[in-house]
Interface confidence: low
Amino acid sequence: CDLPQTHSLGNRRALILLAQMGRISPFSCLKDRHDFGFPQEEFDGNQFQKAQAISVLHEMIQQTFNLFSTKDSSATWEQSLLEKFSTELNQQLNDLEACVIQEVGVEETPLMNVDSILAVKKYFQRITLYLTEKKYSPCAWEVVRAEIMRSFSLSKIFQERLRRKE
């Protein structure tokens, strides 16, 4: 399974949709900026077998899907774009799941890097906590949208590294 090939097109579409979802100028939200501590080291890629790498990517996309599937998200973003974004994420999840099965077989569970997955979970917990504290304000969502765009861009680099490893 050529993971980067199947995944990068969807990643690019998701990034485009995220960009289109922007409703207010980021410059009007500078005071709300926040460092969520993206777990960059987990996306280094050198220490992973491919199945492990896929599981970390899967976790990030699953968490992104969960974040944008909430009631508060539905009340914030333009519904048509949000549905398309969710569609894109779901397609990526399906692709990644198919890749894992191809890599390790249906019966085997890939050797997940639990620490890495936990780091991704905690990253999204910090994002959710920030949104809660900011009472899901438009600026808070704008900051989160920009952060997710950044994390998707970084995961794209991760995929390129995976491709070079092949």
């Epitope: 579409r13 539905s74 048509s80 549905e83 398309k84 969710s86 569609t87 779901n90 397609q91 399906n94």
Partner: antibody, heavy 119, light 108 residues
């Protein structure tokens, strides 16, 4: 497999209301938006609106905002559409269709309920 | 709202004939969200082509779809009796989602 079950027909009097049902099975009900579509005899299709079964959020086609009310009952995994102040113009087949992911968008439809408005 | 105009409204084709149905949008539609449905009398619509050019599961390879912007088409390379049906184009690029008025395709 995914199934959307709708009653075959409803006969109602002008001015009355009718509540149509769409019972889902074969998938996680709360994971997909449910849509409703109208088709008058020999005519095209009109999108009425959609509901997110997870939290009940609805989006309507402006043309149907005062006509249709979409609801869900998660316990019975059923979506409903109430049509009010019925006239002959509302006589049509009403389909429920499941939203979805890329190739699964509207890939699953109910059989449709024929609503006849007649005195 | 985006109005989708289909032409012709009704057409007849002989077995083996090449058939092209068109769908013209009143304003630009993102090609990823332009779909086609087939409907036979007394049945629900069936997803036929998604994202402009991808055939849904079980759709014969003689069908194809193409287009971009405001102009889309569904083509049958060689008409067969089982293809006689109504075909609707549909967009979910923007709200409200809309369908074309349909083309009824008959077999000669």
């Amino acid at each position: 497999q995914v199934q959307l079950q709708q009653p075959g027909a409803e006969l109602v009097k002008p001015g009355a209301s009718v509540k149509l049902s769409c019972k889902a099975s074969g998938y996680t009900f709360t994971n997909y938006w449910m849509h409703w579509v109208k088709q008058r005899p020999g005519q095209g299709l009109e999108w009425i609106g959609e509901i997110n079964p997870s939290h009940g959020r609805t989006i309507y086609n402006e043309n149907f905002k005062s006509k249709a009310t979409l609801t869900v009952d998660k316990s019975s995994i059923t979506a409903f559409m109430q049509l009010s102040s019925l006239t002959s113009e509302d006589s049509a087949v009403y389909f429920c269709a499941r939203g979805g992911l890329g190739p699964a968008w509207f890939a699953y439809w109910g059989q449709g309920t024929l609503v006849t408005v007649s005195a | 709202q985006i109005v989708l105009t289909q032409s012709p409204a009704i057409m007849s084709a002989s077995p083996g004939e090449k058939v092209t149905l068109t769908c013209s949008a009143g304003s630009s539609v993102d090609s990823s969200y332009l779909y086609w449905y087939q409907q036979k009398p007394g049945s629900s619509p069936k997803l036929w082509i998604y994202s402009t050019s991808n055939l849904a599961s079980g759709v014969p390879a003689r069908f194809s779809g193409s287009g971009s912007g405001t102009s889309y088409s569904l083509t049958i390379s060689s008409m067969e009796a089982e293809d006689a049906a109504s075909y609707f184009c549909h967009q979910w690029s923007s709200y409200p989602f809309t369908f074309g008025s349909g083309t009824k395709l008959e077999i000669k």
